[in-house]
């Protein structure tokens, strides 16, 4: 269509097409006609003399783009109790549900909503929550480095440094803190040596860990049982 604004409906000139974003070509009328704006649908298609008649979407229905739909789309069903609504259903947009705090999305659908909100994995003693997450948003566990420990099973706790002792009673390891000996009053004049305990070797498997996608290093998945899958998850 030439650069000037043309009111619909109009017959496209040879070699020109309708303006694709807000117009469509009606084969029956052989005219360029107006699409309906977001939030509306086609009540009556155009003809040679009158343009498209649009109407508002009804409750719980929407259209998100300029369209020539005969009906609006249905909004996704209400969010479940495992989810929170992050975008409401309006005439112009679908409802979007996300996982509630303490959960991650193990299966995201193309509507943008989550089909499977799973509890965040827990890292067992000797393992802390890594600073990065798996691509699906789940917790990643990492073995506590020398000088650090975690004695909890948690989806939030990181490895913490061992306490520093003047006199070391029991060295710490990956899953326990160091134990300091009580200071003897008779030794108070002696220069002190500070002890930072070194951990014992740690076990290499996190507990209750859900996966990230297959292109990342696999993490063992288990629900309190011997894991059988090193799980990868992904939405569409």
């Amino acid at each position: 269509v030439p650069a000037q604004v043309v009111l619909t409906p109009y017959k496209p000139e040879p070699g020109y097409e309708c303006q694709i974003s807000q117009e469509y070509y009606d084969r029956k009328a052989q005219m360029c006609c107006a699409k309906c704006p977001p939030g509306q649908y086609v009540k009556h298609f155009c003809n040679k003399t009158s343009d498209t008649v649009c109407a508002d979407c009804e409750a719980s229905m929407y259209t998100q783009v300029w369209n020539q739909f005969r009906t609006c789309l249905s909004c996704s069903s209400s969010c479940t109790t495992d989810q929170v609504e992050i975008r409401a259903c309006t005439k112009q947009q679908n409802r979007v549900c996300a996982c509630e705090a303490g959960r991650y999305c193990a299966l995201k659908t193309h509507s943008g909503s989550c089909r499977q909100c799973m509890r965040l994995s827990k890292c067992g003693p000797g393992f802390g929550v890594a600073s990065s997450r798996a691509p699906n948003g789940n917790v990643l566990c990492k073995a506590c480095a020398p000088g650090t420990f975690s004695d909890t099973t948690s989806s939030t706790d990181v490895c913490r440094p061992h306490r520093i002792c003047s006199i070391l009673a029991i060295p710490g390891n990956a899953s326990t803190d160091a134990v300091c000996a009580p200071e003897s009053p008779t030794l108070s004049a002696i220069p002190r040596t500070l002890y930072v305990s070194q951990p014992e070797p740690t076990r290499s498997q996190p507990l209750d860990q859900e996966p990230g996608p297959s292109q990342t290093p696999s993490i063992l998945t288990s629900l309190g049982s011997t894991p059988i899958i090193e799980q990868s998850t992904k939405g569409g």
Epitope: T80, N136, D208, S214, Q231
Partner: antibody
Framework: EVQLLESGGGLVQPGGSLRLSCAAS????????MTWVRQAPGKGLEWVSD????????YYADSVKGRFTISRDNSKNTLYLQMNSLRAEDTAVYYC???????????WGQGTLVTVSS | QSVLTQPPSASGTPGQRVTISCTGS?????????VHWYQQLPGTAPKLLIY???QRPSGVPDRFSGSKSGTSASLAISGLRSEDEADYYC???????????FGGGTKLTVLG
């Protein structure tokens, strides 16, 4: 060792009801998503229903929606499938399973046969 | 008719390599969702064989492998053994149906 044991199957007349149970052990049941899958005699697998760990999210196949209800009792480590208005086409072995993240059923029960016939 | 199409049967002799296909559409495999494979030995419950296209659960021999490309996925079994005789099913999430879907199953026969 993970174990899933279904019970409650049997012969029922069309229009009748049945409640299947699935007793779970060997894993933290309250952390697990669960599912029911069925298999008609000599046929393939058909997904029936899913349930989230808390019981807050329930999903059904169109073929059973409005007739079947999935539920769980985390204190008893048991999954249920209440089946109402049964039809001949509901005749199948019903399996309960544990859903891993992203959807694969990583453990299956041995199944219980439901026969709907007059 | 199943949303995922599998050949009804496949066969091979011991030691051979056999491939089973699973063809879907743009609303399931082609949409990027992960494909899972199950093995069902005669008279038993299904068992997870491959998850997330190509991942093997612990205990599954590395003779079994999975792959995915476009709107199709395939399961390959190398070094075929008599105990591999079973039904094999693929499964994936389908966006347009808003449900899990299974292939119709492939009955694998080990000859000889």
């Amino acid at each position: 060792e993970v174990q899933l044991l279904e019970s409650g199957g049997g012969l029922v007349q069309p229009g009748g009801s049945l409640r299947l149970s699935c007793a779970a052990s060997g894993f933290t049941f309250s952390d697990a998503w669960m599912t029911w899958v069925r298999q008609a005699p000599g046929k393939g697998l058909e997904w029936v229903s899913d349930l989230s760990d808390s019981g807050g999210s329930t999903y059904y196949a169109d073929s059973v929606k409005g007739r079947f209800t999935i539920s769980r009792d985390n204190s008893k480590n048991t999954l249920y499938l209440q089946m109402n208005s049964l039809r001949a086409e509901d005749t199948a072995v019903y399996y309960c399973g544990r859903l891993a993240a992203g959807g694969p059923v990583d453990y299956w029960g041995q199944g219980t046969l439901v026969t709907v016939s007059s | 008719q199943s949303v995922l199409t599998q050949p009804p049967s496949a066969s091979g002799t011991p030691g051979q390599r056999v491939t089973i296909s699973c063809t879907g559409s743009s609303s399931n495999i082609g949409a990027g969702y992960d494909v899972h494979w199950y093995q069902q030995l005669p008279g038993t419950a299904p068992k997870l064989l491959i998850y997330s296209n190509n991942q093997r659960p612990s205990g599954v021999p590395d003779r079994f492998s999975g792959s995915k490309s476009g709107t199709s996925a395939s399961l390959a079994i190398s070094g075929l053994r008599s105990e591999d005789e079973a039904d094999y099913y693929c499964s994936v999430w389908d966006d347009s149906l808003n449900s899990w879907v299974f292939g119709g199953g492939t009955k694998l026969t080990v000859l000889g």
